[in-house]
């Protein structure tokens, strides 16, 4: 029987953020409650001087009026004890975007083609999580080498998220677009 | 955009076997599992089983165990289904329809069936 | 394994109108239940998927709602087009099964 704390859940050791930083597609994503990126997802992570890791992300969001527009985020990551788990602050570049505070944990990565990210947002009483959201990574745009989808269906598995993952569609959405030209 | 192509029929002597095809293009192959589904005619439809193209790691309904074995050929993005010791039960149009690797597996696109027909 | 009981198996209807069709799983499928739509010589197509999500290029006179083991799909303002055999399907449990299906005639 798989245990489905989040306090049982493995990342990355020895997480590396100088071999992280660069540029990460979206291949498949476990939304979480509410509103959230919807596709044409890509993420921008950089390591200043100091050794902070920041981000930035592009993708589709529709809105409650059914408006789609391309949405710019930001990102900044506070680390904690363990190198792979962080606190991430983050907002919309446009006001109306979403702002909040969430764990940014690096569930796996080999930095070079793929990484597995988690994060809950409410744990339930027996210690499960209640609201959660999942990122598959992947350097290449146009996906997953064989072996590197095996090993992501494992931690999919591991992080008892298994099969609620949907594919992100990669279609030019977002290419020379933001909110800021659309509305 | 999406294609999955299949033979339109197949005629087959009692006790034979035979390999339906199921040719891919539009997308990645080895990203999603190729699955086979068959439909006796005026019945439902059945799952037989999956494979996953890039390893050809495969997962069978038990009913269908003894009766069919998944391949595939990734150099023509194409998926195979071989069917044995064939008999009237086996008459049947047999779907292939892909699943997501990463996402929920859901069947989101089906080719359009061949038709096998088991007659002497 | 899972049955899918879909109900009915057959019900006629006029353009313009509304059905609703029913599947009933053995147990809880925890709302992974798609709906498809399948015409002769062609394979099924996808509606809806996790219940009520509707595929791209889908209509929203297509819906679908339910949890547990009971889920229900709906066509509103019915057009030429929609009259057709349509297949629920769980797929919570690996060993796919589908409901027996509806065919949808015109009245």
């Known amino acids: 029987e798989r245990d489905c704390r989040v306090s049982s859940f493995r990342v990355k050791e020895n997480f590396d953020k100088a071999r992280f930083s660069g540029t990460w597609y979206a291949m498949a994503k476990k939304d979480p409650e509410g509103l959230f990126l919807q596709d044409n997802i890509v993420a921008e992570f950089s390591v200043d001087e100091t050794g902070q890791m920041s981000a930035t992300a592009k993708g589709r969001v529709r809105l409650l009026n059914n408006w789609d527009v391309c949405a710019d985020m930001v990102g900044t990551f506070t680390d904690t004890e363990d190198p792979a788990k962080f606190k991430m602050k983050y907002w919309g570049v446009a006001s109306f975007l979403q702002k909040g505070n969430d764990d940014h944990w690096i569930v796996d990565t080999d930095y070079d083609t793929y990484a597995v990210q988690y994060s809950c947002r409410l744990l339930n009483l027996d210690g499960t999580c209640a609201d959660s959201y999942s990122f598959v990574f992947s350097r290449d745009p146009n996906g997953l080498p064989p072996e590197a989808q095996k090993i992501v269906r494992q931690r999919q598995e591991e992080l008892c998220l298994a099969r609620q993952y949907r594919l992100i569609v990669h279609n030019g959405y977002c290419d020379g677009r933001s909110e800021r030209n659309l509305l | 955009q999406v294609q999955l192509q299949q033979p339109g029929a197949e005629l087959v002597r009692p006790g034979a076997s035979v390999k339906l095809s199921c040719k891919a293009s539009?997308?990645?192959?080895?990203?999603?599992?190729m699955n086979w589904v068959k439909q006796r005619p005026g019945q439902g439809l059945r799952w037989i089983g999956m494979?996953?193209?890039?390893?050809?790691?495969?997962h069978y309904n038990q009913m269908f165990k003894d009766k069919a074995t998944l391949t595939v050929d990734k150099s023509s993005s194409t998926a195979n289904m071989q069917l044995s010791s064939l008999t009237s039960e086996d008459s049947a149009v047999y779907y292939c329809a892909r699943s997501p690797q990463l996402g929920d597996y859901i069947l989101d696109y089906w080719g359009q069936g061949t038709s096998v027909t088991v007659s002497s | 394994d899972i049955q899918m009981t879909q109900s009915p198996s057959s019900l006629s209807a006029s353009l313009g109108g509304k059905v609703t069709i029913t599947c009933k799983a053995s147990q809880d499928i925890n709302k992974y239940i798609a709906w498809y739509q399948h015409k002769p010589g062609k394979g099924p197509r996808l509606l809806i998927h996790?219940?009520?999500t509707l595929q791209p290029g889908i209509p929203s006179r297509f819906s679908g709602s339910g949890s547990g083991r009971d889920y229900s799909f709906s066509i509103s303002n019915l057009e030429p087009e929609d009259f057709a055999t349509y297949y629920c399907?769980?797929?919570?449990?690996?060993?796919?099964?589908f409901g027996g299906g509806t065919k949808l005639e015109i009245k």
């Open positions: 399907l769980q797929y919570d449990n690996l060993l796919w099964a």
């Open positions: 494979i996953d193209p890039s390893d050809s790691e495969t």
């Open positions: 996790y219940t009520s």
């Open positions: 539009g997308y990645t192959f080895t990203n999603y599992w």
